[in-house]
Interface confidence: low
């Protein structure tokens, strides 16, 4: 950081004074204060003095010695006063120019430190600040009036009292311009417009700044539409809206219209897109499949994308069967709508039970007619599985029910040991039944499968097992024979 | 990230002088428009505004005090310190720095504190 | 000085209540006023400045109204975090004073 003689804050001289500011740094420096006449500057590498052999009250101020080639960005800064009895203000600029809300500092400097306890801030000829006026004084700086308003846009002077006498500084006039933070705000609405040839439309532009110069306009494609303009202003904001009106639109009315503003900030514009048709329309689509397989107990959702012109006149979900007579609860049937035009219609099926499974039908109704849409629900169940002894055909032969969704495989194992179930060091023999016969196959229902293992003499201390598997789940049955040899023979006739 | 933290004498006797620090972190004290005060919390009571000190060394008391209270700063250690004499049990309180800033526009100072540090508590007993 | 008069000094709420606490001055400040959340043992926080700017990072369920001497701090959904002592400050004026405080507790 670069050094400065003298090495005071401040310092505080007569006029004609000579005054030698010296700043040393560690490479070379500038000086940087106020704009006043009579000074020298005399560079020397590392230090740069400057010096007056005749302070006047124009040479108050606050003087930083600035090193360029530091990146840290040190300074050093010394304030001077030339107490002149004849002028206590020095006045950097007589026009300050602020934006709204901003602080404006009003640059009339003190030049004798001493003066500060009986300074103020008064509008020209005297007259007292604007009420909510707040405002604070530095000696160094001058007067800053806190979160300028564009209505304190006035010529003010500094006072001081010197000897019982307030004494005036020259006037500085404060210019506060309103903030334009960018092109003028837009709206057009409708965001999408549908009509029947023939309909009346409304397509509304309207634009809002907080500056009365921007221009708004409403075009048709890429043709300036000439629409007279309303103006208004409220909330602090000018507003002009532009109102198009269409008593029987046709098919020339259709395609894409913009609303466009603009001032000296920018210009902005919104679009949105109107669409004549010959008649009602009504169309139904899911972006799901319309079959859908679901595990038993787990939950879905069914989703309908409507899109129809005029607006729904009625809408239900309805159970088509084949089990219950249920319907489904509205609570669960929810409907969205994306714009005008679109809407979303879910119907949520949690915890799914048997007797759900079914056809589930959307049904829509506008001027345009009527319109369904039909989702297949298909439950899926693990295995279930069943296993009994009989003869056929006179040869001995376990029996292997499985009923699930979707349609099981079956395998058998034979084991040694009673057990529930075999494992991999008990089994002894492992046949897959590729075709097992089908029993029943129905929309909806599980699918039962029938799988037969001949078996001419039933091993004493052994277990067979019709084990079934789906991609759900799997199911298992162990048979153990009660004891040796039973059952061997068939039955008598 | 701006961090502030209080630190000076939990205990202080009737008639001493109370020399608070406050030291802190993620921005300068030489920057445009910045600033730290004090404020104090006697216990169950209100927050009372005690002294900023800004940037250019400007400094700002609260009547009721000023001539017991002394603000300032050191720019290379990033240290601002204030000193009570005549210490009371009245003053016993939780003394908290806070920083203002920073600038909004080029020639606006905020004017609140954004930024606080924990306290510290100090009790005048003999 | 500027007396800043707070009410209410405590109140009882439930998450999800809709919060309103009061800040008058006993003169026009204009709109120099902030608001803060202080919770034992931790710094204080700003959560509006100039009556109703809110202050990045916090949350938009907290918003604050008015300017000259009637200022409102209200939190529209009161969430668990929220519950702690709530102060103003005006700074319009020299000496800076500050609201005796509303400490929100859970019904």
């Known amino acids: 950081i670069p050094v400065i003689e003298p090495s005071v804050p401040e310092l505080v001289v007569k006029p004609g004074a000579t005054v030698t500011l010296r700043c040393v740094g560690n490479g070379s420096v500038e000086w940087d204060g106020p704009p006043s006449p009579h000074w020298t500057l005399y560079s020397d590498g590392s230090s740069s003095i400057l010096s007056t052999n005749n302070a006047t009250f124009q040479n108050t101020g606050t003087y930083r010695c600035t090193e360029p080639g530091d990146p840290l960005g040190g300074s050093a800064a010394i304030h001077l006063y030339v107490k002149d009895p004849a002028r206590p203000w020095n006045v950097l600029a007589q026009e300050v120019v602020v934006f709204e809300d901003q602080d404006a500092l009003l640059p009339c400097l003190l030049t004798d430190p001493v003066l500060e306890a009986g300074v103020s801030l008064v509008r020209v000829r005297g007259r007292p600040l604007m009420r909510h006026t707040n405002y604070s004084f530095s000696p160094w700086h001058g007067f800053t009036i806190h979160r300028a308003k564009f209505i304190q846009s006035q010529d003010y002077q500094c006072s001081a009292l010197m000897g019982g006498r307030k004494v005036m500084s020259i006037s500085i006039r404060l210019k506060v311009q309103k903030v334009i933070p960018g092109p003028p705000a837009l709206t057009l609405v409708p965001a999408e417009l549908v009509r029947i040839r023939g309909e009346a439309a409304q397509i509304v532009c309207s634009a809002s700044s907080v500056d009365v110069n921007f221009d708004v306009f409403l075009q048709h494609n890429n043709t300036k539409l000439a629409i007279p303009q309303q103006s208004d202003f409220h909330n602090n904001r000018y507003q002009k809206v532009l109102t198009l009106n269409l008593d029987q639109v046709d098919f020339q009315h259709a395609g894409n219209y913009s609303c466009v503003a603009s001032n000296v900030q920018g210009k902005h514009s919104t679009s949105m897109f109107f669409r004549v048709v010959e008649s009602a329309y009504l169309n139904l689509s899911s972006e799901q499949n319309l079959i859908q397989e679901v595990t038993v107990g787990e939950g879905l959702n069914l989703k309908v994308m409507v899109e129809a012109y005029p607006g729904l006149q009625g809408f239900n979900w309805t159970y088509l069967g084949p089990f219950s007579d249920h319907q489904p609860e509205p609570k669960l049937a929810n409907a969205t709508t994306k714009d005008t035009y679109r809407h979303t219609f879910t119907l949520s099926l949690p915890r799914l039970k048997p007797s759900e499974a079914g056809r589930y039908s959307f049904l829509a109704r506008n001027p345009g007619g009527w319109r369904a849409l039909t989702f297949e629900l298909t439950l899926r169940y693990p295995p279930e599985v069943s296993v009994i002894w009989t003869f056929i055909n006179g040869s001995g032969t376990l029996l292997c029910a499985a009923s699930g969704y979707p349609q099981p495989n079956v395998t058998w194992l034979q084991c040694s040991g009673h057990t529930d179930r075999c494992d991999e060091a008990q089994v002894l023999q492992v046949w897959d039944d590729p075709y097992p016969e089908v029993l029943s196959q129905e929309p909806f229902h599980k699918v039962t499968v029938q799988s037969l293992l001949t078996v001419e003499t039933l091993e004493h201390n052994q277990t067979y097992e019709c084990r079934a598997h789906n991609s759900v789940g799997s199911g298992s049955w162990a048979f153990i024979p009660i004891s040796a040899g039973a059952h061997t023979h068939p039955p008598d006739e | 990230e701006v961090t502030l933290k209080e630190s000076g004498p939990a205990l202080v006797k009737p008639t001493q002088t109370l020399t608070l620090t406050c030291t802190f972190s993620g921005f300068s004290l030489t920057t445009y428009g910045m600033g730290v005060g004090w404020i104090r919390q006697p216990p169950g009571k209100a927050l009372e505004w005690l002294a900023n000190?800004?940037?250019?060394?400007?400094?700002y008391y609260n009547p009721s005090l000023k001539n017991r209270l002394t603000i300032s700063k050191d720019t290379s250690k990033n240290q601002v310190v204030l000193t009570m004499t005549n210490m009371d049990p009245v003053d016993t309180a939780t003394y908290y720095c806070?920083?203002?800033?920073?600038?909004?526009?080029?020639?606006?100072?905020?004017?609140?504190?954004?930024?606080w540090g924990q306290g510290t508590m100090v009790t005048v007993s003999s | 000085d500027i007396q800043m008069t707070q009410s209410p000094s405590s109140l009882s709420a439930s998450v999800g209540d809709r919060v309103t606490i009061t800040c008058l001055a006993s003169?026009?400040?204009?709109?120099?006023l902030a608001w803060y959340q202080k919770k034992p043992g931790k710094a204080p926080k700003l959560l509006i400045y100039?009556?109703?700017s809110l202050q990045d990072g916090v949350p938009s369920r907290f918003s604050g109204s008015g300017s000259g001497t009637d200022f409102t701090l209200t939190i529209s959904s009161l969430q668990p975090e929220d519950f702690a002592t709530y102060f103003c400050?005006?700074?319009?004026?020299?000496?800076?004073?500050f609201g005796g405080g509303t400490k929100v507790e859970i019904k």
């Open positions: 806070a920083r203002i800033g920073p600038i909004k526009y080029p020639t606006a100072p905020y004017r609140y504190f954004d930024f």
């Open positions: 003169e026009d400040i204009y709109d120099n």
């Open positions: 100039y009556a109703s």
């Open positions: 400050l005006q700074d319009s004026e020299y000496p800076w004073t």
């Open positions: 000190i800004w940037w250019d060394d400007d400094k």
